[in-house]
């Protein structure tokens, strides 16, 4: 009766492939997919190119990359020849106001004046209060503190220099960086007069210069990494190596880690029971009840209720229950699934330069990124600059008279003005013009051509390793049958005939993702906005793409898995994959679960043992070392261990997304031998023999006795 | 009452010298600037000089510089004007005026607000 | 130095009229001028500070306006205790310097 449901069931979602025997793995005859969009996804390209050639002829990135004063002038430029560097008056104004937008479209601005000086403060200085009464020349010229608009009179008080914000009321000590003075070591300014209450300038002042040592801690950062930088690589060559080791150990000892590590998940969600029941219990006899604490938005105050325990517990103990169903009536599946890790573990070691195969994914996305980065920022700085009025504090007496952000020349500044620190500022690059009026537009097409091409490289990566795992799993004699290169004539096959089928499924998720960041910006702007029920709608709209994009790249990767194999067009591969799946939904969520527990354990202790290591050797702690291996003597020790925790974790991503892309092109395999043969001489089965075993299936073997060789 | 008053005015021969007092009452002078400013008979109002909180600036006009010196006594709250090589041109009411700014609020610069009622100093031979 | 100049330099007017006396500063002094009162034989009377807010004690019918280079000092209803001399200076550059004045006197 069950059989007969099953039956029913598989029906529903397609039925069972049939036997091919003209079927050898990934098909060498194959004729080019989706060739409508291949030809959409190469005009786009040419249009991105197109775009990107406007942008560079139109383009001034001279604003983000070259400094430029309150007036617009360059710095190190023309009248400002001899003065190469852009000093901030108030540095920290930049700090609260600075986004990836604002930079992106114009460049580093920020409210405050700035000026261009010939060389940064070196000692810090705030204006002091018997000072304010003394002139500008006394107070900045003669001290050589030439840090003042230009043209500020040199016999006019101090104090009204400074109410104007024509010269600067504090000085940092700073270093060049990008032509911009960024203030550095670790000094103790002496107490700001009369301007406590003064947000724009005193804000975070002491705190910020604490941790804005930029050049004391540059200067260190960089000495470290100048004595530690070969160690550094020795930790990331050992995080590739025990990245290896991993996937290729797991041959051997898949079995006992995958029950060791289901069985720790148990003590885990075990101890949490046992714990959450302590809590209850206290809390129970202490008579703390939720109807006591009532509603309130304070997430921690549900700790001390006893409600909050009992579910939590309730919850572990269904989750415990379920893993304990699943270990007693899954174990089958199990079984299967480890035998697959297995298999993957000796598909990777046959074909060890797929582990290498993320390294060209990296630079494609890199190039990807960087010629949206390059085009966006030409594009930004298209036109020409325009400036407008603008005060530091509009509230001021003598400023609501003032048409704040109305056009202006920048080389007529308001000294008329009533308004105090009313300065003309560059605001952006204008919109007339053909190219100007369409910046919008552009920017959009600039972020679709990066969403599409990066989407685009990974959908490549995946195809072409689903490519060379297939033509090893359907290779009958292994290794003799596998491709001399496989990695490499898959490459060159995905590219030649399935560019349009990739693009396909690249744009699709595209658009989710594009979808996705439209619903981040509308949340964004509506954060004020204290409607729940809006609050709810978005969360719910957000929460449902997040699904959306999560089963689109599920559906995808087994699309290019089939695509690799048979050459069929992507929307026939993508069902193909679905209905293949769908017919074996139990089998791929426990194969699917093993992977992701085994991965993050391997993740884990890559990640932890290069950590360990590092830590124990950077910080001086191993002794005993020969004089080869002593560890450098560091300012900051964590900073090299950081970095080799980071850069292992990198390597470890990078070969287990290479290690599970195996994973699931070999079980996509699997599925398919299971249904396309059934172990006779004509119709052999392709998989391993501890698979059969599983299984409870064999090949039959051939008159003359030769086995075939597994 | 913010008061300001005015003594040591006369009547001098050229190229002598005099000593202008300034008596401050009802406010914390050594908050305070100082100023002197000065009126010619039938004529308008010329600044002469001032004199901040804690005596450690202090500024002149070009017609009285080098020859004039602007001094305060904090702890008797009373302001100084030392005329050398006195000219006819000097001929003027002598005023003292206290500045506004008391060097505590930095947010603006208000100028002159309190005025001595003025003393006459007339340089005859 | 800063030269200060007022016009007219002096007008006749009746109560109750509406009086506009203009000072020019020969370079930009943004807001920092001061307009005193003063009439024979008493000493000035600040009036306005910072261009345009008023001394306290002072009678709202006295208003100043301007930037800059050019302020403006208005009397909107004449009364017979506003018959004086108006001055105007700027603080923000040294030497300070007056305007030459400007009377007032009943028509």
């Known amino acids: 009766m069950g059989g007969k449901q099953r039956d029913k069931d598989d029906e529903a979602y397609g039925k069972p492939v049939k036997y091919d025997p003209s079927f050898r793995g990934p098909i060498k005859n194959r004729s080019c997919t989706d060739v409508i969009c291949c030809v959409l996804f190469l005009l786009f390209i040419l249009g991105y190119i197109v775009v990107g050639i406007v942008a560079w002829l139109y383009g001034d990135p001279r604003q983000v990359l070259y400094p430029r004063n309150s007036t617009g002038a360059y710095c190190g430029m023309g009248e400002n020849k001899d003065k190469p560097y852009l000093l901030y008056f108030n540095i920290f104004s930049c700090i609260l106001s600075t986004n990836i937008i604002s930079v992106a479209e114009n460049g580093l601005q920020c409210p405050t004046p700035q000026v261009c000086v010939s060389s940064c403060p070196e000692d810090p200085w705030t204006v002091g209060k018997n000072q304010f009464s003394q002139t500008v020349g006394e107070v900045f010229y003669t001290k050589n503190r030439n840090f003042c608009l230009p043209g500020v009179p040199w016999n006019m008080m101090v104090i009204t220099s400074l109410q104007q914000e024509l010269c600067p009321s504090f000085l940092l000590p700073s270093a060049p960086a990008l032509g911009r003075c960024f203030p550095w070591t670790n000094v103790t300014l002496p107490e700001l007069p009369g301007i406590t209450n003064d947000t724009t300038i005193a804000q975070g002042i002491s705190g910020l210069i604490d941790s804005l040592n930029a050049r004391d801690i540059s200067v260190k950062i960089f000495e470290d990494f100048a004595h530690s930088w070969y160690w550094i690589l020795v930790a990331l060559g050992v995080a590739l190596l025990l990245s290896l080791l991993f996937i290729l150990l797991l041959r051997l000892v898949a079995g006992p880690l995958v029950l060791v590590l289901i069985l720790g998940v148990l003590g885990v969600l075990a101890y949490g029971i046992y714990y959450c029941w302590e809590e209850y219990r206290v809390l129970r006899d202490k008579g703390a009840s939720i109807s006591q604490l009532g509603f309130t938005t304070n997430l921690s105050a549900y700790q001390s209720v006893q409600e909050t325990w009992l579910a939590a517990l309730i919850v572990l103990a269904v989750l415990e229950a379920i893993l304990l169903l699943v270990l007693i009536f899954l174990r089958q599946r199990i079984r299967i699934a480890i035998a697959l890790l297995k298999e993957a573990s000796k598909a990777v070691g046959q074909m060890m330069s797929t582990m290498f195969y993320p390294l060209v994914t990296f630079v494609l996305l890199l190039i990807c990124i960087a010629y949206w980065a390059m085009t966006a920022l030409y594009l930004a700085t298209s036109g020409q600059p325009q400036y407008v009025l603008w005060a530091s504090n509009i509230s001021s007496p003598g400023c609501e008279k003032v048409s704040i952000n109305t056009s202006c020349n920048p080389m007529d500044q308001p000294v008329n003005s009533s308004c105090p620190g009313l300065m003309c500022v560059f605001q952006g690059y204008s919109s007339k013009g053909l190219v100007q009026r369409s910046l919008f537009n552009l920017q959009i097409y600039g972020v679709l051509g990066l969403f599409w091409t990066l989407n685009w490289v990974l959908a490549l990566g995946q195809c072409v390793l689903a490519g060379a795992f297939a033509s090893f799993y359907w290779a009958f004699h292994k290794p003799q049958d596998i491709p001399t290169f496989p990695l490499i004539s898959a490459f060159i096959r995905t590219l030649r005939y399935h560019t349009g089928s990739l693009a396909f499924g690249a744009l699709i998720l595209t658009l989710v993702q594009i979808a996705r960041v439209i619903l981040e910006y509308i949340d964004h702007k509506l954060r004020g906005v204290q409607n729940p029920v809006a609050r709810c709608i978005m969360c719910c709209f957000k929460c449902c793409l997040w699904c959306l994009e999560k089963f689109i790249k599920f559906l995808n990767r087994n699309a290019y898995i089939m695509i690799a194999i048979y050459g069929k067009n992507f929307c026939v591969s993508a069902k193909n994959a679905f209905t293949l799946l769908m017919r074996n939904i139990v089998r791929v969520v426990v194969l699917d679960k093993v992977t992701d527990l085994l991965l993050f354990f391997g993740k884990l202790l890559v990640v932890g043992g290069v950590g360990v290591l590092s830590f124990f050797f950077f910080s001086g702690r191993i002794q005993g070392l020969g004089r080869d291996f002593k560890s450098p003597h560091l300012n900051y020790y964590w900073l090299p261990i950081m970095t080799s925790i980071m850069g292992a974790y990198v390597i470890a991503s990078g070969f287990f997304s290479v290690f599970g892309m195996c994973v699931d092109t070999l079980f996509l395999c699997f599925l398919e031998d299971l249904e396309r043969n059934d172990g006779s001489l004509d119709r052999p089965y392709y998989m391993s023999k501890s698979l059969l075993k599983i299984l409870g299936k064999k090949n039959e073997a051939p008159p003359d006795n030769k086995k075939r060789k597994k | 009452q913010v008061q300001l008053v005015e003594s040591g005015g006369g009547v001098v021969q050229p190229g002598r010298s005099l000593r202008l007092s300034c008596a401050a009452s009802?406010?914390?002078?050594?908050?305070?600037?100082m100023h002197w400013v000065r009126q010619a008979p039938g004529k308008g109002l010329e600044w002469v000089a001032v004199?901040?909180?804690?005596?450690?600036?202090?500024y002149y006009a070009d017609s009285v510089k080098g020859r004039f010196t602007i001094s305060r006594d904090n702890s008797k709250n009373t302001l100084y004007l030392q005329m050398n090589s006195l000219r006819a041109e000097d001929t003027a009411v002598y005023y003292c005026?206290?500045?506004?700014?008391?060097?505590?609020?930095?947010?603006?610069?208000?100028?002159?607000?309190?005025w001595g009622q003025g003393t006459t100093v007339t340089v005859s031979s | 130095d800063i030269q200060m100049t007022q016009s007219p330099s002096s007008l006749s007017a009746s109560v109750g009229d509406r009086v506009t006396i203009t000072c020019r500063a020969s370079?930009?002094?943004?807001?920092?001028l001061a307009w005193f009162q003063q009439k024979p034989g008493k000493a000035p009377k600040s009036l306005i500070y910072?261009?345009?807010s008023l001394q306290s004690g002072v009678p709202s019918k006295f208003s100043g306006s301007g930037s800059g280079t050019d302020f403006t000092l208005t009397i909107t209803s004449l009364q017979p205790e506003d018959f004086a001399t108006y001055y105007c200076?700027?603080?923000?550059?040294?030497?300070?310097?007056f305007g030459p004045g400007t009377k007032v006197d009943i028509k």
């Open positions: 200076q700027q603080y923000t550059i040294y030497p300070f310097s």
């Open positions: 004199i901040w909180y804690d005596g450690s600036n202090k």
């Open positions: 009802g406010f914390t002078f050594s908050s305070h600037g």
């Open positions: 005026a206290r500045d506004a700014y008391s060097g505590y609020d930095y947010y603006y610069y208000y100028g002159m607000d309190v």
């Open positions: 910072g261009a345009s």
């Open positions: 370079q930009g002094i943004y807001t920092y």
